[in-house]
Interface confidence: medium
């Protein structure tokens, strides 16, 4: 159920496992389900009471090169009259994903898995009120 | 990471594309960093479109545990704390990359897999279809 740290024996190795140098793993970056598409409700980023914009970040030494990040448009939330209500807060919702980072060291290249935090969208929350004594 | 020597013409032979298969270090960068304190939040309870979190477990995947959001209501919570069905709670979905053991059960051989997760919910104005 888990990926061990370096040096942990994980599964009894089936015969078909490829040989891998110690401290490393073989990673096929041909993505399974590559063509799967998100079937989110239409343009929820604009229809939300906590609307957001998208920014595409691009890095040629990262796989995938494109990562889309959301930013909340407002501090408050949009009320029924279409006005910003600052008694409520628009806050980002975040999710971790994995990327592969390519690193150049002189005339050599190495690859490292990296955990990246992606802001996916925003939600409207009641603020936490801190009462001053 | 595992260093791969480049060919002798190195400075001019930069390959812009990633190879199909790479050897990567077992240690994941940022594995245990709490990158943003806002991530560890109670938004799921305080949202006007609150959600529950369900544990999705798969021993052949890394990470093996993923928490999936499910919106609690069809509508949104209004100022009085009641569900308002003139608005809709909808899931915010995101494609994320995970590692899948390939071949199955192999200790150090993986393939990237794209999976769709519901991360949370947001309150939206419904799309009204006018009948002609």
């Amino acid at each position: 159920r888990k990926i061990p740290k370096v040096g942990h024996t994980f599964f009894q190795k089936p015969e078909s496992c490829p040989p891998v140098p110690g401290g490393s793993m073989k990673l096929d970056i041909g993505i399974i389900n590559e063509n799967q598409r998100v079937s989110m409700s239409r343009n929820i980023e604009s229809r939300s009471t906590s609307p957001w914009n998208y920014t595409v970040t691009w890095d040629p030494n990262r796989y995938p090169s494109e990562v889309v990040q959301a930013q909340c448009r407002n501090l408050g939330c949009i009320n029924a009259q279409g006005k910003e209500d600052i008694s409520m807060n628009s806050v980002p919702i975040q999710q971790e994903t994995l990327v592969v980072r390519r690193k150049h060291q002189g005339c050599s290249v190495s690859f490292q898995l990296e955990k990246v935090l992606v802001t996916v969208g925003c939600t409207c929350v009641t603020p936490v009120i801190h009462h001053v004594q | 990471g595992i260093t791969i020597p480049r060919n002798p013409g190195c400075p001019n032979s930069e390959d812009k594309n990633f190879p199909r298969t790479v050897m990567v270090n077992l240690n994941i960068h940022n594995r245990n960093t709490n990158t943003n304190p806002k991530r560890s939040s109670d938004y799921y309870n305080r949202s006007t479109s609150p959600w529950n979190l369900h544990r999705n477990e798969d021993p052949e995947r890394y990470p093996s545990v993923i928490w999936e959001a499910k919106c609690r209501h069809l509508g949104c919570i209004n100022a009085d704390g009641n569900v308002d069905y003139h608005m809709n709670s909808v899931p915010i979905q995101q494609e994320i990359l995970v590692l899948r053991r390939e071949p199955p059960h192999c200790p150090n051989s993986f393939r990237l897999e794209k999976i769709l997760v519901s991360v949370g919910c947001t309150c939206v104005t419904p799309i009204v279809h006018h009948v002609a």
């Epitope: 159920r1 888990k2 990926i3 061990p4 740290k5 942990h8 024996t9 994980f10 599964f11 009894q12 | 994941i28 594995r31 245990n32 709490n34 304190p37 991530r39 560890s40 939040s41 109670d42 799921y44 309870n45 979190l53 369900h54 544990r55 477990e57 021993p59 990470p63 093996s64 545990v65 928490w67 059960h105």
Partner: antibody, heavy 119, light 107 residues
Framework: QVQLQQSGAELVRPGASVKLSCKAS????????IHWVKQTPVHGLAWIGV????????AYNQKFKDKATLTADKSSSTAYMELSSLTSEDSAVYYC????????????WGQGTTLTVSS | SIVMTQTPKFLLVSAGDRVTITCKAS??????VAWYQHKPGQSPKLLIN???NRYTGVPDRFTGSGYGTDFTFTISTVQAEDLAIYFC?????????FGGGTKLEIK
């Protein structure tokens, strides 16, 4: 160093509820799951459920779904387990344990809380 | 749920003896098995994870092995301070389950 400090022994009446606590120190509380375990002389150790303090997510052993409610307070780095409609069957030692989500194993346990349900 | 059957329930040994405890899972749990030591009045301590991986700081007289359904925990040379209850746990899939424990007593 990592510590899970559990609340003291409880003696409660049948039908009542009790809230046990597990205070974490020595690490970032939001990063790792807290699991709860019940120990009785007759049935041994039984897994109750898990809470992820970072996202509030919970999952329960079906046997304890209507008995236990898991919560966490990030401001005090404390996980809680509330046990309701108590009977003598709930008399046990209850442990919290930390699960290293990315490394993938349980490492630290609390010292346990003894709950006695008796009239 | 997965049943972990641990044997024996009791062991009475002399210092210097070799001790073996087994845990049998009712279905394959790969090697997602941990072994713990529980001394009276203390928290349980992790000794072995991933069936055979000795946890940080654990003396090398404690070893574990196994894969699938059959797991073994060994203390190569028992010492007086090893008096405790030892138990296994599978965390392959929830609900996570435990062996019944083995009480180790020193003559």
């Amino acid at each position: 160093q990592v510590q899970l400090q559990q609340s003291g022994a409880e003696l409660v009446r049948p039908g009542a509820s009790v809230k046990l606590s597990c205070k974490a120190s020595g690490y970032t509380f939001s990063d790792y799951e807290i699991h709860w375990v019940k120990q009785t002389p007759v049935h041994g150790l039984a897994w109750i459920g898990v809470i992820h303090p970072g996202n509030g997510g919970t999952a329960y052993n079906q046997k304890f779904k209507d008995k236990a409610t898991l919560t966490a307070d990030k401001s005090s780095s404390t996980a809680y387990m509330e046990l309701s409609s108590l009977t003598s069957e709930d008399s046990a030692v209850y442990y919290c344990e930390r699960f290293l989500t990315y490394e993938g194993y349980f490492d630290y346990w609390g010292q346990g809380t003894t709950l006695t349900v008796s009239s | 749920s997965i049943v972990m059957t641990q044997t024996p329930k009791f062991l009475l040994v002399s210092a210097g003896d070799r001790v073996t405890i087994t845990c049998k899972a009712s279905q394959s749990v790969n090697n997602d098995v941990a072994w713990y030591q529980h001394k009276p009045g203390q928290s349980p301590k992790l000794l072995i994870n991933y069936a055979s991986n000795r946890y940080t700081g654990v003396p090398d007289r404690f070893t574990g092995s196994g894969y699938g359904t059959d797991f073994t925990f060994t203390i190569s040379t028992v010492q007086a301070e090893d008096l405790a209850i030892y138990f296994c746990q599978q965390d392959y899939g929830s609900p996570y389950t435990f062996g019944g424990g083995t009480k180790l007593e020193i003559k």
